[in-house]
């Protein structure tokens, strides 16, 4: 006899990286027939929702109107059908951004390199942080962590045309509180014609559309909540 129901999916809309004072909705999708959903934050009960017809009962939304550092952290949800509870969802790491200062991102030897050259990004922030994050814009949201007192190095090694794209960095005050994003650095990798034509390239965005990027980078993933979960987890672990 089944003792628990399958775990629900959890995700954040429009994104799990939320600028401070902006709104975010945490979504929890369970099964039809669910009569109660519970959202847990850092292991404690945070909110309860009990949908009734004609509300769709397989998915609920928990709205956070004003994101701040106290709301940032790890969320999970569970649901109940009759007396039977589900397994808990995967953990959703909700990150508050635009905290305190703005780091500076630079690249060595420069933003235009030849395929095979060694490239290193440097992220610098003169305030109290020791962890830095480098993100390549685009649907895949590639993330690297780096450490240093005021600056972190991100060696990419010998680059290929697949490394082309726009990069930004954050200073991280803790796992769930990040600085403003740096100004973008666009890395242009030139190679022979055959390599260039076949190389994948993430979409890039102008410097003033970081907000748009946050809204759009995961849109393809929102249709696949398992992949969304996986991406969110890997970003912070």
């Amino acid at each position: 006899q089944q003792q628990t129901l399958p775990k629900p999916f959890i995700w954040a809309e429009p994104h799990f990286m939320v600028p401070k004072e902006k709104q975010v909705t945490i979504c929890c999708q369970g099964n039809y027939g669910a009569v109660e959903y519970q959202l847990h934050f850092e292991g404690s009960l945070f909110a309860v929702d009990r949908p009734k017809p004609p509300e769709r009962i397989n998915k609920v939304q928990f709205y956070i109107p004003d994101m701040n550092s106290r709301m940032a952290g790890q969320y999970s949800c569970i649901y109940r059908v009759g007396e039977l509870w589900s397994e808990p969802s995967n953990l959703l790491d909700l990150v508050v951004t635009e905290m305190y200062d703005t780091p500076t991102l630079s690249v060595h030897p420069g933003p235009e390199v030849i395929s095979g050259e060694k490239v290193t990004f440097y992220c610098r922030l003169d305030t109290a942080t020791s962890m830095f994050l480098l993100l390549k814009e685009g649907r895949s949201s590639h993330v690297q962590r780096g450490y240093g007192k005021v600056q972190a190095e991100f060696p990419l090694g010998p680059v290929t045309t697949a490394h082309r794209g726009t990069y930004r960095c954050f200073g991280s005050y803790n796992n769930h509180a990040w600085s403003f994003p740096s100004e973008p650095v666009k890395l242009l990798v030139t190679g022979d014609i055959e390599n260039t034509s076949l190389a994948p390239e993430d979409p890039t965005f102008p410097a003033d559309t970081w907000g748009t990027y946050l809204l759009t980078t995961e849109t393809g993933l929102q249709k696949d909540h398992a992949l969304w979960d996986h991406t969110a987890q890997n970003l912070l672990r």
């Epitope: 017809p53 004609p54 769709r56």
Partner: antibody
């Protein structure tokens, strides 16, 4: 885009059974949501009659005194209303409607059924 | 059955006005309340559910509030297309019951 269309006779004699069908296009009635019948007597307010859910379960308004049945034909993507022993008080515009918040609802255009001999 | 009493039954207002319609339930309905708009000769359309949540695609000038037995629909700045009749619906208990309606007319 989901569309609903009511069909059935516009005139029913007292004591007979009113039968209406709602044909749904653009959305499967078994995939989600609640498929309702709602009526509105001329110049008056709305009254909920009942629904059949995506899974086939029913809820009815008991004020209709067990005169109401809502069923479905999944092969035709239709759901139907039967209201027995009608009187003049059952004269109304009858709407079929899909409700499933937070999604925007969808309604038929409504069909006027007059109960008269 | 839960009785839903709407007020006022009719209301005159001008484009740009802020308008408030209220609905009172005969018992606590735990915020399981929706609001509908109906134009003459047309089917109703949902605006708000769970007392204060906007149905997908509904303009943000519509908002809902309230708890317990008392609920309010507010239109922050009336547009010409907002002149219609508004109904509340409780779905906390079966049978679902509508309020009697509020007719919003042009002043």
């Amino acid at each position: 885009q989901v569309q609903l269309q009511e069909s059935g006779p516009g005139l029913v004699k007292p004591s007979q059974t009113l039968s209406l069908t709602c044909t749904v296009s653009g959305y499967s009635i078994t995939s989600d949501d609640y498929w309702n019948w709602i009526r509105q007597p001329p110049g008056k307010g709305l009254e909920w009659i009942g629904y059949i859910s995506y899974e086939g379960s029913n809820n009815y308004n008991p004020s209709l005194k067990n005169r109401v049945t809502i069923s479905r034909d999944t092969s035709k993507n239709q759901f139907s209303l039967k209201l027995s022993s009608v009187t003049a008080a059952d004269t109304a515009v009858y709407y079929c409607a899909r409700l499933g918040y937070p999604a925007m609802d969808a309604w038929g255009q409504g069909t006027l059924v007059t109960v008269s001999s | 059955d839960i009785q839903m009493t709407q007020s006022p039954s009719s209301l005159s207002a001008s484009v740009g006005d802020r308008v408030t319609i209220t609905c009172k339930a005969s018992q606590d309905i735990n915020s399981y309340l929706s609001w509908f708009q109906q134009k003459p000769g047309k089917a109703p359309k949902s605006l708000i559910y769970r007392a204060n949540r906007l149905v997908d695609g509904v303009p943000s000038r519509f908002s809902g509030s309230g708890s317990g037995t008392d609920y309010t629909l507010t239109i922050s700045s009336l547009q010409p297309e907002d002149f219609a009749t508004y109904y509340c619906l409780q779905y906390d208990e079966f049978p679902w019951t509508f309020g009697g309606g509020t007719k919003l007319e042009i002043k």
